[in-house]
């Protein structure tokens, strides 16, 4: 009986989940449906006796196929230049961290962070992002003066569209900025880096919002906003880029309990974007004008938006008053770089289909870390190449560009049978010389089966060893690119190889 | 066999508060769902709150939204009701109640109930 | 929220007796229903869920039926413990809710 319940609420469960989908329902009670759903099958599973068990990855995971590294690879190598180029050295911190750690720097996100079941000695958390540890080493280590660059996964319980390069376990690259220096040439350097990335990555049109907290909480303050409640409609603000105002006004008044008018007042600021021009404009406003935190933001705005002239990258750049991004720690500049889908008619402007890189100063985060409170002026980007190896992965995919997964140069084969061993010595002989070859695991290879191997795995060149050569003293070497075959003396082949190959002198 | 013991209710003024808590002992307690229904004197049944497995998931009825905060401590097996602002009628019995099946919104086991009066 | 609405509110019978109970959702709630006995001073006890299936350990002569907004708790032979009040509650979606009760006093 016990059973047949189990099935028939199974049955019932598919439907309502079913039924919640074409009624739209929203995402976190589809999400919630799903787990029960899925709670009911497992009891199901166990009440057989021998749970299916179902081989996949965790929720909000994936695997990376050798051909979706070889793309994750050419991104960071972009990444990993540019943050090189302009002098930054690497570090690295642990996967999780105490829990008080990232207690209190999250704001309304620590929801997301993920705690370590207690095994009786801390209380840990997996990094919710590479900031917060990056300024914990600093007071750790009582660092004043550090430019850093660091690449590690990060960890967030979000409910995430992994169509949409979002995940639960996912990369970030961080470039920060550590040191008391005269203002704006280091923020004005992040957004240099930040766009020369983009660039870099070709994925398409980009545009990078900035705006500046103290302009975000002195705009809050001028129209009403009570102290209490600055953080949480930053948090309604930074929807807009989702969602119309209409929406984000109905969340400030209805489920925030902001007053309608004050929530007005707010729209006819955050509605507009601009460049200097608009940075000047709100310097004369007769409100804004009369607070100190906005007219300092807008001041060092200005001359921000000085030097990003100078770096050539003004262009790329919009002051959008609507960006609040969501975490508690930032205390100054702050931007966020979207792709841009092109408009379908003339006279429209670009659309921002997500962010794909953002950033900003934390001025505060590493006095929250020294028992003096002494602070160390931050500045930091962070790029989402989750997003990027989604966007990147799916041009291949719609150019069927084939991607090449290894780096070997050479195929070791052989003509006829019984040449193992002559060809594991050539093998080792090209090892030796710091050239990446391969040989099939084969005694006696069909030479057809070795030459299909070569062409497929894309390798450049395949060297034949056959009686006749080995009694001349040469290597047959083909080409898979002109298909010439040409016969190489054997203590010629490492030096032929590297012409080839374009590769520079080496050994391992 | 599945026990849930309730503590934590008494007599309360207006604006005041209180925090419920539930014992749980005789089953998995972090495979289920949790949920508090109240019951006013001589009224009907009134489910308030629930709190998933994990405590991803939470939601109030809307008269209580905002003022009450539902959590558990699935290493102690224990659920909580946190009441803010008390009003009058909030006045009601208070069970804590399992899901069927772990997930259904249908409570197969409840405890005693803990008396929660708010007056001046 | 889906208004539950039980009838008759209160019904006298004698042991023996067959008695059914009429609950009816305001929208339609597929099976998503369970039936409740409760006594007084006693936290509710389950008797029926998804509309028809009897909670172990709950006698046979309670049984359930219907599905979309009608729904029926019926007892076959009305024994002495079974005097009490008796609730439905829809457990489609949140807030779930219950029925006012339906008081089953003897005759």
């Known amino acids: 009986a016990d059973r047949a319940a189990l099935e028939e609420l199974v049955r019932l469960q598919g439907a309502h989940v079913r039924g919640l989908k074409e009624q739209k329902a929203s995402a976190e009670q589809i999400e919630e449906e799903v787990t029960k759903l899925l709670k009911l099958k497992a009891q199901l599973g166990q009440d057989e006796g021998k749970q299916k068990f179902v081989l996949k990855t965790p929720k909000g995971t994936r695997d990376y196929s050798p051909r979706q590294m070889a793309v994750r690879e050419k991104v960071f190598d972009v990444i990993i230049r540019c943050f090189k180029r302009h002098g930054a050295e690497v570090i690295d911190t642990p996967v999780f961290e105490l829990k008080e750690t990232l207690t209190g720097k999250y704001g309304e996100d620590s929801k997301l962070i993920y705690d370590l079941k207690d095994q009786g000695g801390e209380l840990l958390s997996l990094r919710y992002d590479l900031t917060v540890p990056f300024a914990r080493y600093l007071a750790m280590n009582k660092l004043t003066n550090i430019k850093r660059y660091h690449i590690a996964k990060v960890y967030r319980r979000d409910n995430p569209a992994m169509t949409r390069g979002r995940y639960r376990e996912f990369y970030q690259c961080d470039f920060d900025i550590a040191g008391q220096f005269d203002p704006m040439i280091p923020d004005a350097e992040c957004l240099k880096i930040m766009c020369e990335i983009l660039s870099s990555l070709q994925i398409g049109n980009f545009l990078v919002k900035v705006n500046d907290r103290r302009i975000l909480d002195g705009m809050f303050a001028v129209c009403g906003v009570p102290d209490s409640k600055f953080r949480t409609i930053c948090s309604s603000v930074d929807k807009l880029d989702k969602v119309s105002w209409e929406e984000v006004k109905n969340e400030m008044v209805g489920e925030k309990g902001l007053a309608p008018e004050v929530a007005d007042r707010i729209g006819d600021y955050v509605q507009q974007h601009g460049g200097v021009s608009l940075v000047e404009q709100l310097l004369q406003d007769p409100k804004l004008s009369q607070n100190k935190q906005a007219v300092e933001g807008l001041g060092d705005l200005k001359l921000l938006f000085e030097y990003l002239i100078l770096f050539g990258i003004d262009d790329k750049i919009s002051f959008d008053l609507s960006l609040a991004r969501g975490l508690d720690y930032y205390t100054g500049v702050i931007y966020e770089a979207v792709l841009l889908q092109m408009p379908t008619q003339a006279g429209e402007e670009p659309l921002g289909v997500g962010s794909i890189a953002a950033g900003g100063r934390y001025d505060g985060l590493v006095g929250m870390f020294d028992p003096k409170g002494r602070k160390v002026p931050c500045v930091g980007l962070s790029i989402g190449v989750e997003r990027i190896f989604s966007i990147v992965e799916q041009r291949l995919e719609a150019s069927e560009e084939k991607v090449r997964t290894t780096e070997t140069q050479v195929l070791v084969a052989s003509a006829q049978k019984k040449l193992l061993e002559e060809r594991l010595k050539l093998v080792s002989e090209l090892w030796d010389a710091g050239i990446k070859a391969e040989l099939l695991y084969k005694k006696n290879p069909k030479l057809l089966n070795q030459l299909q191997y070569w062409e497929e795995a894309g390798i450049p060149l395949v060297a034949i060893i056959g009686e006749q050569e080995l009694r001349d003293g040469v290597i047959k070497l083909r080409s898979v690119a002109s298909r010439e075959e040409v016969d190489v003396r054997r203590e010629d082949l490492v030096e032929e190889i590297r012409r080839r190959t374009n590769q520079p002198l080496s050994t391992c | 066999q599945v026990q849930l013991v309730e503590s934590g209710g008494g007599l309360v003024k207006p604006g005041g508060s209180l925090r419920l808590s539930c014992a749980a002992s005789?089953?998995?307690?972090?495979?289920?769902?949790m949920s508090w229904i109240r019951q006013a004197p001589g009224k009907g049944l009134e489910w308030v709150s629930y709190?998933?497995?994990?405590?991803?998931?939470?939601n109030y009825t809307d008269s209580v939204r905002g003022r009450f905060t539902i959590s558990r401590d699935n290493a102690k097996n224990s659920l909580y009701l946190q009441m803010n602002s008390l009003r009058a009628e909030d006045t009601a019995v208070y069970y804590c109640?399992?899901?069927?099946?772990?997930?259904?919104?249908?409570?197969?086991?409840w405890g005693q109930g803990t008396l929660v009066t708010v007056s001046s | 929220d889906i208004q539950m609405t039980q009838s008759p509110s209160s019904v006298s019978a004698s042991v023996g007796d067959r008695v059914t109970i009429t609950c009816r959702a305001s929208?339609?709630?597929?099976?998503?229903l369970a039936w409740f006995q409760q006594k007084p001073g006693k936290a509710p006890k389950l008797l029926i869920y998804?509309?028809?299936n009897l909670e172990s350990g709950v006698p046979s002569r309670f049984s359930g039926s219907g599905s979309g907004t009608d729904f029926t708790l019926t007892i076959s032979s009305l024994q002495p413990e079974d005097f009490a009040t008796y609730y439905c509650?829809?457990?489609?979606?949140?807030?779930?809710?219950f029925g006012q009760g339906t008081k089953l006093e003897i005759k």
């Open positions: 109640a399992r899901y069927l099946y772990q997930v259904i919104a249908v409570a197969d086991s």
């Open positions: 709190i998933s497995d994990s405590s991803t998931y939470t």
């Open positions: 998804v509309a028809s």
């Open positions: 509650q829809q457990a489609n979606s949140f807030p779930y809710t």
């Open positions: 929208q339609g709630i597929s099976s998503w």
């Open positions: 005789g089953f998995t307690f972090s495979d289920y769902y």
